[in-house]
């Protein structure tokens, strides 16, 4: 018995294509690239029907439906734009992922363009079906920092967003009587990591043992401008506290530490990471100008004892900053060796300040970042961490501030963070 003539579906074909079909003949219905066979609301690659003894076909011819990749996956810290009109998500449609600039940028300079493939998945030429990654930009404040004229600016108020990497670290040990509470500064390196000085996070013991404070006792504030108003700031608890294993409490050698935040912080105009320098044992060049910010000493007559006894009271409500030149290593070493007391300026430190002293040359909290503008990448790089200074008041003549030389610890920092791609590489453009 002969079965009726078959019409292939729109965007499809039937095989074999014959003039006549008889009992037991079978045909395979398939669709063009980018289309799927649809039968009873079920999608399939092919569908077979057979000519029955009574001259009818075993099934109706199915339809061919265009492949739909459906709504593309959400991109963390990213946006999606549809290149095809009506926001189509069907075969050959195109979408573009982009990152929330200027706070995030796409890893590997990916185009972010994805096309709906015949298989029904969004595909990128390089990444395939994997989504791109948006990584934090570093060292680019939303407000441009002041031009580095060679003059100290003592205790100047920092505008909000000028130091978006600045973190206030508050340590409160409630297990001790009376409660121990102190503060320091740090610098945001990625959405999850803060760089600071080890002595800020060392448990305050009377002996020389180096034990980190319990992570439960650490709170980090980011995007903070005025300590009296923490409402606009992001506060985070610590997931990990990592002190450099060789930190020496007696001479403050290797005074560097990291805090991993409990949750990654959202970046924005007031919260952005600073860039790490290239590993460079020489450290920053003498006479280069850097900036240090902090809620610390803004009164040149405050002594170290007074700072310690002030407890949690920060000495400045609004974030202050100062501009300081790097001091030649030999000069700084000599200035400390000439003092009574056992001062050791090691190869893991550098000094900054002015010979003549002056107001606020040691402004800034322990652990705060000494940042230098890197001409190569056009970004701010953390070259130092506020570490220690002489016994005299802030700003005394020839008492330079001593900073941890961050560029000696690049490998250590990366190793602790364990995520080579958690910090974006600074783009360097001609």
């Amino acid at each position: 018995n002969e079965c009726p003539e078959l019409q292939p579906p729109v965007h499809g074909k039937i095989e074999p294509s014959q003039a006549k079909y008889f009992f037991k003949d079978q045909v395979l219905v398939s669709c063009d690239t980018g289309y799927k066979v649809l039968k009873d609301n079920v999608e399939m690659d092919t569908f077979q029907i057979e000519c029955l003894k009574d001259g009818t076909w075993s099934n109706k011819i199915p339809t061919c439906k265009i492949v739909d990749c459906r709504a593309p996956g959400e991109l963390e810290h990213g946006l999606i734009t549809f290149s095809t009109r009506n926001n189509l998500t069907t075969y050959k449609s195109e979408i573009k992922y982009s990152c929330q600039e200027p706070y995030y940028k796409m890893l590997n300079n990916n185009t972010g363009i994805y096309t709906c493939s015949a298989q029904g998945v969004w595909m990128n030429k390089v990444l395939g079906r994997s989504l791109p990654t948006c990584l934090p930009e570093c060292g680019q404040p939303s407000r441009s920092l002041p031009s580095l004229v060679k003059r100290i600016i003592g205790g100047r108020n920092a505008e909000p967003g000028l130091f978006p990497w600045q973190a206030l670290i508050v340590v409160e040990d409630t297990s001790r009587v009376p409660n121990d509470k102190w503060f320091g500064s740090g610098a945001l390196l990625s959405a999850s990591w803060i760089l600071t000085a080890a002595h800020v996070l060392r448990s305050q013991r009377r002996d020389t043992t180096v034990i980190p404070v319990s992570k439960e006792h650490v709170t980090v504030y980011l995007g903070l401008h005025d300590v009296r108003d923490k409402s606009g700031a992001v506060n985070s608890s610590a997931a990990r506290v990592v002190l450099h294993p060789d930190f020496n409490i007696q001479n403050y050698n290797h005074d560097i530490a990291l805090v991993q935040l409990q949750e990654p912080v959202p970046l924005g105009p007031h919260v952005m990471p600073v860039c790490l320098p290239r590993l460079e044992p020489e450290g920053p060049a003498p006479h280069m100008l850097g900036l240090v910010a902090g809620w610390g000493i803004s009164n040149p007559n405050v002594t170290v004892d007074e700072i310690i006894s002030s407890g949690t009271r920060t000495l400045s409500d609004v974030l202050q900053y100062v501009k300081l030149p790097v001091v030649p290593h030999a000069e700084c070493k000599t200035s400390y060796e000439s003092r009574s007391g056992n001062y050791s300026v090691t190869e893991n430190m550098f000094c900054a300040g002015y010979y003549e002293g002056g107001k606020d040359t040691c402004l800034g909290d322990s652990g705060g970042a000494f940042v230098i503008f890197d001409d190569l990448s056009q970004r701010w790089v953390v070259q130092g961490l506020v570490s220690w200074g002489g016994p005299e008041e802030c700003g005394s003549k020839q008492v330079y501030g001593v900073y941890t030389k961050v560029s000696n610890y690049v490998d250590w920092v990366w190793e602790q963070m364990g995520l080579p791609q958690s910090v974006v590489e600074p783009q360097v453009e001609r």
Epitope: L107, N108, N109, L276, P277, R278, L279, P281, E347, L376, S377, N408, V410, D411, W412, W414, E415, P420, E425, P426, Q427, V428, E429, R430
Partner: antibody, heavy 120, light 107 residues
């Protein structure tokens, strides 16, 4: 994934110049230093120098400063090293390499090497 | 320039043994030292950086130690695939310099 693909074997005459290429893929080319390393049998490895493709900044080993020139084409993600005034001492395998992190100075990724033979 | 000395050009070992390759710097390089493995006809591969950090994917039988001027690469439970040449490299000062290499051979 990070890949560095180097140009093929070169047979050169003494006094000539050779231009070696190193095509990078799988990362942001402009942000990482490209290192060049020479290896002669029985002479171990010798660092020639480095270039930061994004800025064109270079650092050379004094032993090669007068004869090696590094360039980078950011449109094709390719770094080049030109070595001039070749002698038989320059017969070696030349590698390009890249650090793991943008801030590091040890070499995590290496090209397959280009063999240069200098012979009259 | 900083001279990196690998005094042993060859070292004989047996499968399953523990072997230590040493490297000495002519001046203090801090922790800024890397170890590489190179097999015949292949490019060098990074094993250890910052004197003691193992590069990703490197088996934990490879350990690095030392700081300043004296460094050691230790391979415990040597496997046949470890037979190769090992180079140290300082990256503390320009120019970066490599040791002359130590070849690991089977007894």
């Amino acid at each position: 994934q990070v890949q560095l693909k180097q140009s093929g074997t070169e047979l050169m005459k003494p006094g000539a110049s050779v231009n070696l290429s190193c095509k990078a893929s799988g990362y942001t080319f402009t942000a990482y230093w490209i290192e060049w390393v020479k290896q002669r049998p029985g002479h171990g490895l010798e660092w020639i120098g480095e270039i930061l493709p994004g800025s064109g900044t270079t650092n050379y080993n004094e032993n090669f400063k007068d004869r090696a020139t590094f360039t980078a084409d950011t449109s094709s993600n390719t770094a080049y090293m030109q070595l001039s005034s070749l002698t038989s001492e320059d017969s070696a395998i030349y590698y390009c390499a890249r650090s793991y992190y943008y801030a590091s100075r040890w070499f995590a990724f290496w090209g397959q090497g280009t063999l240069v033979t200098v012979s009259s | 320039d900083i001279v990196m000395t690998q005094s042993q050009k060859f070292m004989s070992t047996s499968i399953g043994d523990r072997v230590s390759v040493t490297c000495r710097a002519s001046q203090n390089v801090g922790p800024n030292l890397a170890w590489y493995q190179q097999k015949p006809g292949q490019s060098p591969k990074a094993l250890i950086y910052s004197a003691s950090y193992r590069f990703s994917g490197v088996p934990d039988r490879f350990t690095g130690s030392g700081s300043g001027t004296d460094f050691t690469l230790t391979i415990s439970n040597v496997q046949s695939e470890d037979l190769a040449e090992y180079f140290c490299q300082q990256y503390n000062r320009y120019p970066f310099t490599f040791g002359s290499g130590t070849k690991l051979e089977i007894k």
